[in-house]
Interface confidence: medium
């Protein structure tokens, strides 16, 4: 479990403002909702609605919250310990091989095929041949997870020291 953290994932450096709570690091690590200070002496809380950290970490910055794109709805807001959860609007879906954008679902099946699955935020309508019952070759397999995040957003642990 590892994730590459790129510069754009990091919120601009913040000095701990008075409202940001400081806590004592434990074995050089800070808990979810915090990042470590430059001198390694404090854990500084992330800013609610602006940035977050999901794991115990030694990040110098919290991760910037994802903003839902147009064409997406916000299922849950960004908290200090969890990124924003975005989902494609009704009538659109996110393909596994192009997760950066929501695509319009097909309105119907090609001739000779019947619809067996509805449009969902994570899959297009599903069509099968009337006779054989086999799937349409252009069918996109349903993605298991409905929770989506923008590219580069870590869904797994991040530690600068490994």
């Amino acid at each position: 479990e590892s994730a590459l953290i790129t510069q754009q994932d990091l919120a601009p450096q913040q000095r701990a403002a008075p409202q940001q709570k400081r806590s004592s690091p434990s074995e050089g690590l800070c808990p979810p909702g915090h990042h470590i200070s430059e001198d390694g002496r404090d854990c500084i809380s992330c800013k609610y609605g602006q940035d977050y950290s999901t794991h115990w970490n030694d990040l110098l910055f919290c991760l910037r919250c994802t903003r839902c794109d147009s064409g997406e709805v916000e299922l849950s807001p960004c908290t200090t310990t969890r990124n924003t959860v975005c989902q494609c609007e009704e009538g659109t879906f996110r393909e596994e091989d192009s997760p950066e954008m929501c695509r319009k679902c097909r309105t119907g099946c090609p001739r000779g095929m019947v619809k067996v699955g509805d449009c969902t935020p994570w899959s297009d309508i599903e069509c099968v041949h009337k006779e054989s019952g086999t799937k349409h070759s252009g069918e996109v397999p349903a993605v298991e997870e409905t929770v989506t995040s923008s590219p580069g957003t870590p869904a797994s642990p991040c530690s600068l020291s490994g």
């Epitope: 479990e1 709570k21 806590s23 004592s24 434990s26 074995e27 690590l29 808990p31 979810p32 909702g33 854990c43 999901t54 794991h55 115990w56 310990t81 797994s156 642990p157 530690s159």
Partner: antibody
Framework: QVQLVQSGAEVKKPGSSVKVSCKAS????????ISWVRQAPGQGLEWMGR????????NYAQKFQGRVTITADKSTSTAYMELSSLRSEDTAVYYC?????????WGQGTTVTVSS | DIQMTQSPSSLSASVGDRVTITCSAS??????LNWYQQKPGKAPKLLIY???SLHSGVPSRFSGSGSGTDFTLTISSLQPEDFATYYC?????????FGQGTKVEIK
């Protein structure tokens, strides 16, 4: 809703070992530390140690060092606490708990009785 | 290890009373102190973290204060459901340590 479900009560002989499990659901298991806290009958709370599953690193209270082993299986979201060389004074309720500096979720507790 | 000492060990009070429990650390722990409530046969519950921050769902009659080595938990107006044992816990330095507990009983 985060839930921590612990294994059932155990009766053990002095000198033996006990392994208590703690299965987490409804949250990100790897993200937080899992601490183990025990409470002897009529006594206070005693922190034994903890593990951060994401790193696999464990920390132990000096009192239990060498006698306790805390592990975690990320694939099943389960933490384990094994205490060896049991003695009568280890009779207690053992709690697992989710920790991120403060403990916000606790297991229901596992009673371990050490008796000959 | 950092030693945490609570006082009193037990106290008797009536519904509506203002109750104060103190917790003293053997060395400075800045603000890294939590308070828990425990009822018989139940797991503890977090009340206050980081000395004075109220955990979600905890009534506002509970408050915490202090810094360094001396800390206080105050219940402004004791309610029937508040009769329990209260523990402080430091997280300034591993191993985390708890106070011995303060039992709040009905007078």
């Amino acid at each position: 809703q985060v839930q921590l479900v612990q294994s059932g009560a155990e009766v053990k002989k002095p000198g033996s070992s006990v392994k208590v499990s703690c299965k987490a659901s409804g949250g990100t298991f790897s993200s937080y530390a899992i601490s183990w806290v025990r409470q002897a009958p009529g006594q206070g709370l005693e922190w034994m140690g903890r593990i951060i599953p994401i790193f696999g690193t464990a920390n132990y209270a000096q009192k239990f060092q060498g006698r306790v082993t805390i592990t975690a299986d990320k694939s099943t979201s389960t933490a384990y606490m094994e205490l060896s060389s049991l003695r009568s004074e280890d009779t207690a309720v053992y709690y697992c708990a989710r920790e991120g500096f403060y403990i916000d979720y606790w297991g229901q507790g596992t009673t371990v009785t050490v008796s000959s | 290890d950092i030693q945490m000492t609570q006082s009193p060990s037990s106290l008797s009070a009536s519904v509506g009373d203002r109750v104060t429990i103190t917790c003293s650390a053997s060395q400075g722990i800045r603000n890294y102190l939590n308070w828990y409530q425990q009822k018989p046969g139940k797991a503890p519950k977090l009340l206050i973290y980081y000395t004075s921050s109220l955990h979600s769902g905890v009534p506002s009659r509970f408050s915490g204060s202090g810094s360094g080595t001396d800390f206080t938990l105050t219940i402004s107006s004791l309610q029937p459901e508040d009769f329990a044992t209260y523990y402080c816990q430091q997280y300034s330095k591993l191993p985390w340590t708890f106070g011995q507990g303060t039992k709040v009983e009905i007078k």
